[in-house]
């Protein structure tokens, strides 16, 4: 079996984290986050070959049925593994806050 | 905000938990796996357009800047929120045994 | 290297007001957050509150509202802490610490002892 | 607000040992703890966020792990350097909370 990690596809094509810089009102947070004005997102971004970063078992069939019937079955997809928490300071309805959100950076990547 | 189960694209068309029948051939399993020799393979598939079954706040950063983006940044991906375990009949190298895999069949779905 | 310099010690009357400085350099002032922590002797860390340094909005533990206020001077990459109404509940060490959206309190300055003492 | 609990205030430890400084959270924080050392007269030093990344830096001797409730800290290959207190501190909700501190000393 090929490496898990090792992209045949060429460096960088492959599912990984990547860091997209973006500002509040990119975000559609302007009406509500106050600080930080920009943040930069880590997201999941590539492409999903055979054997490449699969999260499990599903992930294997899914793919083995992608290459059966292309049209029904989508190849996998790069998603994140893990998040890392993210501070924000926001309004409310009182006044400020510190918020501090779970679900919101990806802090590493696999295929479902 | 729309109703995050209403897909806008028409009925089916959005992510949700589909069957695919699958042989032990068709899943690569045919020189370990004894039984079942056919599989209702759950999983999710379908468009996850602005809103709909959003997984989390990533969820939706990742359809903002999709739409700032599209080249860069792709849409959210439909993947199992949850999975039902499966029990196979396999071979080992004592005989055979009973083995349940929690992480094969989708049990529901959303967008990441 | 990122450096936070306060003073060592500071010693003031029951009653009376404080105001403690956290010096930065070693990076963009404007583009973390300032947190400040409480420490009394042989205790535990408590944390009193944060400020945005580019936009001074504040955020404070409850306990401290009223009793902290947290401003910044960005001309001189400075924060401030005024403590007001001080009694001797309020000797302790106090540290600035740097703080990010992700990185929490990831450099910290060697702290103000104050005394509150007649 | 959110209680952290070091139950062992001191733990005991010799140079080249493994040891877990355990950390335990009134309610559920997710990954957001962080975990600090600090020595007699030093302003505390950032090892671990978000539960288990280190801080540039950091000697990959210390390894920070859990979710949830419980959270470790664990010193493999202890070195004398180390011997100091060690604080976990929550930052999932407001106010942030820290743990009492558990002092890592020679046997």
């Known amino acids: 079996a090929r490496n898990g990690d090792r992209c045949p596809l060429g460096p960088g094509r492959c599912c990984r984290l990547h860091t997209v810089h973006a500002s509040l009102e990119d975000l559609g947070w302007a009406d509500w986050v106050l600080s930080p004005r920009e943040v930069q997102v880590t997201m999941c971004i590539g492409a999903c070959p055979s054997q490449f970063r699969e999260a499990n078992m599903h992930a294997q069939i899914k793919m083995n049925l992608h290459r059966l019937k292309p049209d029904t079955v989508p190849a996998p997809c790069c998603v994140p593994a893990s998040y890392n928490p993210m501070v924000l300071i926001q309004k409310t309805d009182t006044g400020v806050s510190l918020q501090t959100y779970d679900d919101l950076l990806a802090k590493d990547c696999h295929c479902v | 905000a729309r109703n995050g189960d209403r897909c806008p694209l028409g009925p089916g068309r959005c992510c949700r938990l589909h069957t695919v029948h699958a042989s032990l051939e068709d899943l690569g399993w045919a020189d370990w796996v004894l039984s079942p020799r056919e599989v209702q393979v759950t999983m999710c598939i379908g468009a996850c357009p602005s809103q709909f079954r959003e997984a989390n706040m990533h969820a939706q950063i990742k359809m903002n800047l999709h739409r700032l983006k599209p080249d860069t940044v792709p849409a959210p991906c439909c993947v199992p929120a949850s999975y039902n375990p499966m029990v196979l009949i396999q071979k080992t190298d004592t005989g055979v045994s009973l083995q349940t895999y929690d992480d094969l069949l989708a049990k529901d779905c959303h967008c990441v | 290297q990122v450096q936070l310099q306060q003073p060592g010690a500071e010693l003031v009357m029951p009653g009376a007001s404080v105001k403690m400085s956290c010096k930065a350099s070693?990076?963009?002032?404007?583009?973390?957050?300032m947190h400040w922590v409480k420490q009394r002797p042989g205790q535990g860390l408590e944390w009193i509150g944060v400020?945005?340094?580019?936009?001074?909005?504040?955020s404070y533990n409850q306990k401290f509202k009223g009793k902290a206020t947290l401003t910044v001077d960005e001309s001189s990459s400075t924060a401030y802490m005024q403590l007001s109404s001080l009694t001797s509940e309020d000797s302790a060490v106090y540290f600035c610490?740097?703080?990010?959206?992700?990185?929490?309190?990831?450099?910290w300055g060697q702290g103000t002892t104050l005394t509150v003492s007649s | 607000d959110i209680v952290m609990t070091q139950s062992q205030k001191f733990m005991s430890t010799s140079v080249g040992d493994r040891v877990s400084v355990t950390c335990k959270a009134s309610?559920?924080?997710?990954?957001?703890v962080a975990w600090y050392q600090k020595k007699p007269g030093q302003s505390p030093k950032a090892l671990i966020y978000?539960?288990?990344t280190r801080y540039t830096g950091v000697p990959d001797r210390f390894t920070g792990s859990g979710s949830g409730t419980d959270f470790t800290l664990t010193i493999s290959n202890v070195q004398s350097e180390d011997l100091a207190e060690y604080f976990c501190?929550?930052?999932?909700?407001?106010?942030?909370?820290f743990g009492g501190g558990t002092k890592l000393e020679l046997k």
């Open positions: 610490a740097r703080g990010g959206t992700t990185v929490v309190l990831d450099y």
């Open positions: 070693g990076y963009t002032f404007t583009d973390y957050w």
């Open positions: 400020i945005d340094t580019s936009e001074s909005y504040t």
């Open positions: 309610q559920n924080v997710g990954t957001a």
């Open positions: 978000s539960a288990s």
């Open positions: 501190q929550q930052y999932s909700s407001s106010p942030w909370t």
